[in-house]
């Protein structure tokens, strides 16, 4: 029998040499085909995300498809041979007879493959979305936990203030918030989470112990501690949180705030509408600046905070969200931004020269024994300053957002709700400039930093959503804010790096800035961080404040700085609106900068702990930050300014009447900003119920070893 069996040939009967190919038709046709190489399709190889099942299905389909193609190829060959009159054997004939079937199967398999590939992609997308969602949820949980830690640190820290203690014992409405016993418990607990430096232990170890206490408190464990349990302590702390005591306006400025009221009185009470370009609000120039502490927390009167959404969030919530944002954004080279005095009375001087004179006058006043000039001023030209911290575009003259008033204005009732660019600075509260500073819907007619005037009660609870929404400054948010000149909107400069921390200012990612490439010099040297990440961060701060952590692989442990509430002030410029402010690599101010005080993002390094009594000499060191080369810099050098006396610079040496060696002051380890003198160190200096001398640093050493995420 012609073995028609296996060949499927068709052709010429028995005569003639076997088809040379040995394609024994039938089989080939049968498609049995040797094992086709398994799925070569890209889809099948997407493995990682794809479920195993989908992978296998695609593999099978792929193999089948290739077998069918191979089979069809043979059938075509057989038919061709048949057409030439060549005899096919039975197998080949059988195969040829199935030509249509094979063709149909092939089409079907292709369709199936397409469907499964699409399905596979959908699955992948779904898995990615799910993973992302889970990641966001995890991040959110972490942020909440961090927020709680910061709140806790703030509260514990504040409890060192006698006035606060008294208030809490007396209660706001006569109802005591805490008993003496509870205060004592918190004092005891404070010693655990802010331990004296034990040189027999490694710092790491010491804070590890402290962090365990904090953790157990957060968990509300039933474990005993300080003669009670963490659970009880947690309830006590929560009671304090819920009392909103710290959200209302209390004039506890962590130290001296001597004639605040008088000082800020001259501030214009009502905002000048945008149309009136230069209401000459004056900087109240006080010679007591040195002895004054600045309250960074409560800047803006409620009326001035015209956010799109009016829901209110407990200011704690917001501030910590912001702190978290900034922490998460801790750049690898977290520039040592330090809190600036934030009570600003916007002044729009008509003449740049006048403004410059005013600045110089202020500087002169600040030349007292404390050498008050902030490094941040100097750092503006300092290469060590993080390139990400760049100055903002010159302000539109119409923006009443002038220089910070370097005095301690009354804190009145502006709540601590995260003002742009600032996490509230409690007397020694952790202040981290908000990376996600956004122009929370500030209307154009209102300066970003309002003079702290009347005691307008700021809504206590701005919904976190709202903050988050404004934090994200998505394009939908730009309605109110876009009326501000681009420069006036707080910015998180995340151009090339993920190091916006501490550099509050204009959110370049906000829609209004999308087209303003000139605002920042994208070529400024920055450490090689995941640039694409940061560039993508347009919508990063969304309703769930889900910043991606990927932009900074190592979180610089800036808890120190956080404690310092590193805040920066948007130096409001009154340059012409069209001046695009190009920041060069060395952070020089552009020539157009008409202002005398061109400090957009000037970190002030607030030495919180000093008020506690002791010097915080080591602060700077502990707070080393990553310099431009991503190398860890000790705090001292990191904060040393270098004057670049460029003509553009708002500060040339000549501007200061007395030459001073700023670097010397920097070596103290903390910026001169709030170096307290021999004046009263504020209630915080008091021993706070503990025996022995006052703790030098009640400000919770920030758990330096604890990574945020």
């Amino acid at each position: 029998m012609p073995s028609a069996t296996s060949h499927s040939g068709s052709g010429s009967k028995s005569s003639g040499p076997p088809p040379p190919s040995g394609s024994s038709g039938s089989e080939a046709a049968a498609g049995a085909g040797a094992a086709a190489p398994a799925s070569q399709h890209p889809a099948t190889g997407t493995g990682a995300v794809q479920t195993e099942a989908m992978k296998q299905i695609l593999g099978v389909i792929d193999k089948k498809l290739r077998n069918l193609e191979k089979k069809k190829g043979k059938l075509d060959d057989y038919q061709e041979r048949m057409n030439k009159g060549e005899r096919l054997n039975q197998d080949q004939l059988d195969a040829v007879s199935k030509y249509q079937e094979v063709t149909n199967n092939l089409e079907f398999a292709k369709e199936l493959q397409r469907s499964f590939m699409a399905l596979s992609q959908d699955i992948q997308k779904t898995i990615k979305k799910t993973a992302r969602r889970e990641q966001l949820m995890r991040e959110e949980a972490e942020q909440k936990r961090l927020k709680t830690v910061l709140e806790l640190q703030y509260v514990l820290d504040k409890l060192g203030d006698d006035e606060v203690r008294t208030d809490l014992k007396q209660g706001l409405n006569g109802v005591p918030i805490l008993s003496e016993e509870e205060l004592s418990l918190l004092d005891e607990f404070y010693k655990l989470v802010d331990p004296e430096r034990d040189m027999s232990l490694r710092l790491n170890e010491q804070y590890e112990h402290a962090s365990i206490h904090l953790w157990d408190l957060l968990e509300g464990k039933e474990k005993p501690v300080c003669g009670t349990t963490y659970k009880v302590l947690k309830e006590i702390v929560e009671r304090v949180f819920q009392s909103n005591y710290f959200d209302s306006t209390h004039n506890h400025q962590n130290g001296l705030c001597e004639e605040e009221e008088a000082a800020s009185a001259p501030a214009v009470e009502d905002q000048v509408p945008e149309a009136e370009p230069e209401p000459a609000e004056e900087y109240t120039e006080q010679s007591e600046v040195e002895s004054t502490e600045y309250v960074n927390r409560q800047f803006m009167a409620e009326t001035q905070f015209t956010s799109g959404e009016k829901e209110q969030v407990d200011e704690w919530t917001v501030e910590t969200v912001e702190v978290v944002n900034s922490l998460q954004q801790q750049p690898q080279a977290a520039s040592p931004s330090v809190p600036e005095p934030h009570s600003l009375t916007p002044v729009a001087q008509a003449d740049p020269l006048v403004r410059r004179q005013r600045v110089q006058d202020l500087m002169a006043q600040m030349q007292g024994p404390y050498n008050f000039i902030q490094d941040s001023m100097l750092d503006f030209e300092n290469q060590t300053l993080d390139p990400a911290i760049v100055s903002a575009q010159p302000m539109n003259p119409t923006q009443n957002m002038d220089m910070p008033q370097l005095v301690c204005p009354p804190v009145h009732s502006e709540s601590r709700l995260a003002q742009p660019n600032q996490v509230p600075v409690q007397p020694e509260a952790t202040q981290v400039p908000l990376v996600s500073s956004t122009s929370e819907g500030y209307t154009a007619s209102q300066p970003l930093y309002q003079p702290s005037h009347a005691t307008e009660q700021r809504p206590q609870k701005e919904p976190i959503d709202q903050i988050q929404a404004t934090i994200s400054l998505n394009t939908d948010q730009t309605t109110a804010s876009s009326s501000l000149p681009a420069a006036s909107q707080p910015q998180v400069f995340q151009a090339g790096t993920s190091k916006p921390l501490h550099s509050s200012g204009i959110n370049v990612n906000a829609a209004p800035f999308q087209s303003m490439q000139t605002v920042f010099n994208m070529n400024a040297p920055v450490p090689p961080v995941n640039e694409p990440e940061t560039l993508k961060q347009q919508n990063q701060y969304q309703a769930s404040y889900n910043q991606s952590f990927s932009s900074q692989p190592h979180q610089v442990e800036q808890t120190e700085l956080q404690q310092e509430q590193l805040q920066t002030v948007v130096g409001t410029y009154h340059g012409s609106p069209d001046q695009s402010h190009q920041v060069t690599g060395n952070h020089q101010q552009p020539p157009q900068q008409n202002t005398g005080f061109p400090r957009s993002n000037q970190p002030y390094y607030n030495s919180r702990g000093v008020s506690r009594g002791g010097s915080r000499g080591a602060r700077g060191l502990m707070n080393g930050y990553r310099g431009p080369a991503n190398g860890f810099r000790g705090g001292y050098d990191g904060y040393r300014p270098s004057f670049s006396n460029t003509p553009n610079s708002g500060y040339t040496q000549s501007q200061f009447s007395a030459p001073r060696d700023y670097s010397g002051y920097q070596r103290d380890g903390y910026q001169q900003n709030f170096k307290r003198g021999s004046g009263q160190s504020g209630p915080r200096g008091a021993p706070r119920g503990r025996g022995g001398p006052p703790r030098p640093n009640r400000g919770m050493p920030q758990m330096n070893t604890q990574q945020v995420n």
């Epitope: 296996s6 010429s12 076997p18 040995g22 054997n89 059988d94």
Partner: antibody, heavy 111, light 112 residues
Framework: SLEESGGDLVKPGASLTLTCTAS?????????MSWVRQAPGKGLEWIAY???????TAYANWAKGRFTISKASSTTVTLQMTSLTAADTATYFC??????WGPGTLVTVSS | DVVMTQTPASVEAAVGGTVTIKCQAS??????LAWYQQKPGQPPKRLIY???NLDSGVPSRFKGSGSGTDFTITISDLECADAATYYC??????????????FGGGTEVVVK
């Protein structure tokens, strides 16, 4: 299926015609119908095939002249055997191509 | 006609073992070769066609290979049911030359 018939006990020198009947299909153009035999305890031996499409036939060298394969109808193929000898004693199978086989029919040549 | 020579005539192997049977054609037949399994009292059952293609329903333990004049079938993971006689057959049909569809002599596989 296929079924062979016509097997019998015959004397040497006799002739015999075997028939292969198809059920469930008819012999259309694309089939080779073959005959194969197997002597008791021996191996398979191909005899001949016919290509139904054009009636072309092929035979094993040893079968030429004594065996003839033909298509009798759309469902039957026959094998005519002449001058049988004892060596022709075997089970005869018909097959379509080489895939489908009948159960075989026994031909015994004996005196 | 082409002559097919099959070796060995008989082979014994244990369950789970492997058996290889060879078939040699007297002239090149390309890949026109089929392998059959036959058990006593039954007609042959084709296992492989075109030298290496498995018929449907045949376990993949059966593997055919070769082309031209030398062919082999390998049965791995032997099972008791594999005990049978195996044949090779030339399945070439060509108008120019008559190859004939000769069978090999067969190989008996005994499974212990």
């Amino acid at each position: 299926s296929l079924e062979e018939s016509g097997g019998d006990l015959v004397k040497p020198g006799a002739s015999l015609t075997l028939t292969c009947t198809a059920s469930g299909f008819s012999f259309s153009g694309s089939y080779y119908m073959s005959w194969v035999r197997q002597a008791p305890g021996k191996g398979l031996e191909w005899i001949a095939y016919i290509y139904i499409g054009d009636g072309v036939t092929a035979y094993a060298n040893w079968a030429k002249g004594r065996f003839t394969i033909s298509k009798a109808s759309s469902t039957t193929v026959t094998l005519q055997m002449t001058s049988l000898t004892a060596a022709d004693t075997a089970t005869y199978f018909c097959a379509r191509g080489n895939k489908l086989w009948g159960p075989g029919t026994l031909v015994t040549v004996s005196s | 006609d082409v002559v097919m020579t099959q070796t060995p005539a008989s082979v014994e192997a244990a369950v789970g073992g492997t058996v290889t049977i060879k078939c040699q054609a007297s002239q090149s037949i390309s890949s026109y070769l089929a392998w059959y399994q036959q058990k006593p009292g039954q007609p042959p059952k084709r296992l492989i066609y075109d030298a290496s293609n498995l018929d449907s329903g045949v376990p993949s333990r059966f593997k055919g290979s070769g082309s031209g004049t030398d062919f082999t079938i390998t049965i791995s993971d032997l099972e008791c049911a594999d005990a049978a006689t195996y044949y090779c057959q030339c399945t070439a049909v060509s108008s120019a030359t008559i190859y004939g569809n000769a069978f090999g002599g067969g190989t008996e596989v005994v499974v212990k």
